[in-house]
């Protein structure tokens, strides 16, 4: 902040700038601003050791102009070195100089371990300049000192391309012990031996700690900081704080639980969230963790079908993202489904069953023994087959798909018939005389199609050709038999 | 009373040098740092540097570097600035200005400007 | 370099008026900002430094105020002598800068 002392005080913000002032031609003293950069590169100057009998950092510019004529040394005077002072008291310090005014420019700049204290820091400078000497005093002021305030001040001058450095004003902030570790909420096995760490700091040292377990102090003795206290287990959950003392006063950490680690409790809310023919999404809130983290989860699943033999289907998953996709399920079964999840104490028990459904899905095989024959009287295709076996069905048959391909002379046809559920038999009006008819079936379900079943092939010959013999569907690895009459 | 008196009006062929003196008195010369401004014809105010009159030690603004020179005189307390190879771009009133004390950079102080008029 | 950029360049006003001239940094430059007035072929006046500090002599209708980045220069109530330009100048660092002027005419 700046001020110029003629009639009254004016207080002005600081900057972290160029060094100001007015000097008047009446030389009134006159308060201005700390601290800028100018284009000269500096020279650092180091601060004297402590107890040194001096007063300040001397310099001695080296610039002389064409006549040669040396600037005279220059020096901060000696200040207070140490203050130490309570925590949210207010705080002021200053450097001074006189600068003679032969020097022309100067700038000056607090700086605090190290580091510029730029921006609107409560810093004052106070210019008296004279005819020949200009006398600066550059103040600063804490309100409310913090902890953070703790450090070594120092004021630069920069002044002809050098540095000239105060001696350090070593701040020091004196408080309630302040944590620097403060003991940490567990989740311990029973009966197993841990530690828990407090570290709290001044100043003033020393700082001493007591522990509290569930309100009741653990050592009758206090220990230096840091302490560490080796807890031998536990059986049941407690409450752990940390109280530290210096002569300020004592402060207490934040009270930490310590869980004891348990089997999770079951999973809940198990939900089914898609069904198809053979496989269910199943979702799962988890239960409490039991202070460890799951690891992994079972889904068993049993036939809910009276006959069935009973047996349970288990399907081990990761824990997230408590979802699950039950497969190689039979499409139109019914099923029992429960989750049971794990973490490193052991199983939770299993969740609440319920119950779920798969879907009728299209038949998983074709029609078996298709056969084919010509029955040229009526000038007809008799074909024949069995059923799947009901297993294999999927689902409740409603008819057949009867794919016909007749081929002749390099011309293709396929037509397709519809059956209804309960023939075994069907027969097919000849499309083509002198070609080859494929046959091929596919069971119906309200599921979809099943598979189509290996191409059987007759050859229709001409008219007045006698049918001999019936074409079938051919042992495995045969290859397509053809009829030729 | 404190002034700054500078030279007359200068008509210069480009590429020519022109040299203004700026002569003070009412103060000590040498505890006051002495700048110098120019001001082309209804354009603003341009600092081209200023030179510690004690030491003789002088800072040009980048702009003028290698082309401008300060210089002082303690015995008659005159302060000079000589600006080389000069173009028509060069043609403004130029101000000696004061320093106002050790701990600022603004000017208490101003000539009354000198005209450099730069033509062929 | 910190640019100074001062608004507006013209500025019409009648005397008694109060008028108030704006000078923006391109940079903080706390309170180091100054104030010239210049009239035609006289060299500058020094109104105010530190951005708000009065030089010796002049009027108490002149004001200045502001820090950081954003300045102004307020004449209370005009009169005919004020009729000039003006001009702001950081120092808080060199190269040393000045805006471009505003001019105050008699509307």
């Known amino acids: 902040a700046i001020t110029e002392a003629r009639e009254e005080a004016k207080p002005y913000p600081l900057f972290p700038g160029p060094f100001p002032g007015s000097l008047q031609t009446d030389h009134t003293p006159l308060l201005s601003l700390p601290h800028a950069s100018g284009y000269q590169p500096a020279l650092m100057f180091s601060p004297t050791q402590p107890g040194r009998p001096h007063t300040g950092n001397v310099a001695i510019p080296q610039v002389t102009s064409v006549e040669s004529k040396p600037l005279p040394p220059l020096a901060f005077k000696h200040t207070v070195g140490h203050i130490i002072l309570s925590e949210h008291k207010g705080v002021k310090f200053n450097c001074s100089i006189s600068v003679p005014n032969i020097y022309q420019d100067t700038t000056i700049s607090w700086w605090k371990d190290g580091k510029e204290l730029l921006g609107a820091h409560h810093a004052i400078t106070q210019f008296y300049p004279d005819d020949e000497v200009t006398a600066i005093i550059a103040s600063f002021s804490i309100t409310s000192v913090q902890r953070s305030d703790n450090g070594s001040y120092i004021c630069k001058m920069k002044i002809n391309n050098e540095e000239i450095v105060s001696d350090p004003i070593y701040i020091e902030v004196q408080g309630l012990p302040h944590f620097t570790k403060q003991p940490e909420s567990m989740n311990v096995t029973r009966n197993t031996a841990f530690n828990l760490t407090c570290q709290a700091v001044g100043p003033p040292e020393p700082v001493n700690i007591f522990w509290v377990q569930n309100s009741s102090r653990v050592n009758e003795q206090p220990e230096k900081s840091p302490s560490v206290l080796t807890v031998p287990g536990l059986t049941e959950m407690a409450v752990f704080s940390c109280e530290a003392h210096n002569d300020k006063g004592l402060t207490v950490s934040k009270g930490v639980q310590i869980n004891i680690k348990a089997i999770p409790s079951p999973p809940t809310e198990v939900s089914i969230r898609n069904s198809t023919a053979h496989s269910i999404l199943i979702s799962w809130v988890p239960g409490f963790d039991g202070y460890s983290p799951f690891r992994n989860c079972s889904i068993q699943v049993k036939e809910a079908d009276p006959l069935s033999n009973g047996s349970v289907m288990i399907f081990n998953t990761s824990a997230l993202p408590h979802l699950y996709q039950i497969k190689q399920l039979q499409a139109l079964a019914n099923y029992s489904i429960g989750v049971s999840c794990m973490n490193e104490i052991g199983w939770s028990a299993v969740s609440p069953w319920i119950l779920a459904s798969t879907t009728e899905g299209a038949p998983s095989v074709a029609p078996l023994n298709v056969t084919v024959f010509l029955n040229e009287s009526s000038d007809n295709v008799d074909i024949r087959w069995m059923k799947p076996p009901t297993k294999q069905q999927d689902g409740e048959l409603v008819g057949y798909r009867i794919s016909h391909v007749w081929q002749s002379a390099g011309i293709s046809k396929e037509l397709l018939e519809e059956v209804g559920q309960n023939g075994s038999r069907a027969r097919i009006s000849v499309q083509v005389h002198n070609a080859t008819c494929t046959v091929r079936i596919a069971a119906v379900t309200r599921g979809g199609v099943g598979p189509f079943s290996d191409p059987v092939k007759i050859f229709i010959p001409a008219h007045g050709w006698v049918d001999y013999a019936p074409s079938s569907t051919p042992a495995p690895g045969n290859a397509d038999p053809v009829l030729i009459i | 009373q404190v002034q700054l008196v500078q030279s007359g009006a200068e008509v210069k062929k480009p590429g020519a040098s022109v040299k203004v003196s700026c002569k003070a008195s009412g103060y000590t010369f040498t505890n006051y740092g002495m700048n110098w401004v120019r001001q082309a014809p209804g354009q603003g105010l341009e600092w081209m540097g200023w030179i510690n009159t004690y030491t003789g030690e002088p800072t040009y603004a980048d702009d003028f570097k290698g082309r401008v020179t300060f210089t002082t005189d303690t015995s008659t307390s005159t302060a000079y600035m000589e600006l080389r190879s000069l173009r028509s771009d060069d043609m403004a009133v130029y101000y000696c200005?004061?320093?106002?004390?050790?701990?600022?950079?603004?000017?208490?102080?101003w000539g009354q400007g000198t005209t450099v008029t730069v033509s062929s | 370099d910190i640019q100074m950029t001062q608004s507006p360049s013209f500025l019409s006003a009648s005397v008694g008026d109060r008028v108030t001239i704006t000078c923006k940094a391109s940079?903080?430059?706390?309170?180091?900002v100054t104030w010239y007035q210049q009239k035609p072929g006289k060299a500058p006046k020094l109104l105010i430094y530190?951005?708000?500090t009065r030089h010796t002599g002049v009027p108490d209708r002149f004001s200045g105020s502001g820090s950081g980045t954003d300045f102004t220069l307020t004449i209370s109530s005009l009169q005919p002598e004020d009729f000039a330009t003006y001009y702001c100048?950081?120092?808080?660092?060199?190269?040393?800068?000045f805006g471009q002027g505003t001019k105050l005419e008699i509307k």
């Open positions: 940079q903080d430059v706390g309170d180091a």
């Open positions: 100048q950081q120092y808080r660092s060199y190269p040393l800068t």
């Open positions: 530190w951005a708000s």
């Open positions: 200005a004061r320093k106002s004390t050790v701990v600022s950079r603004y000017f208490d102080v």
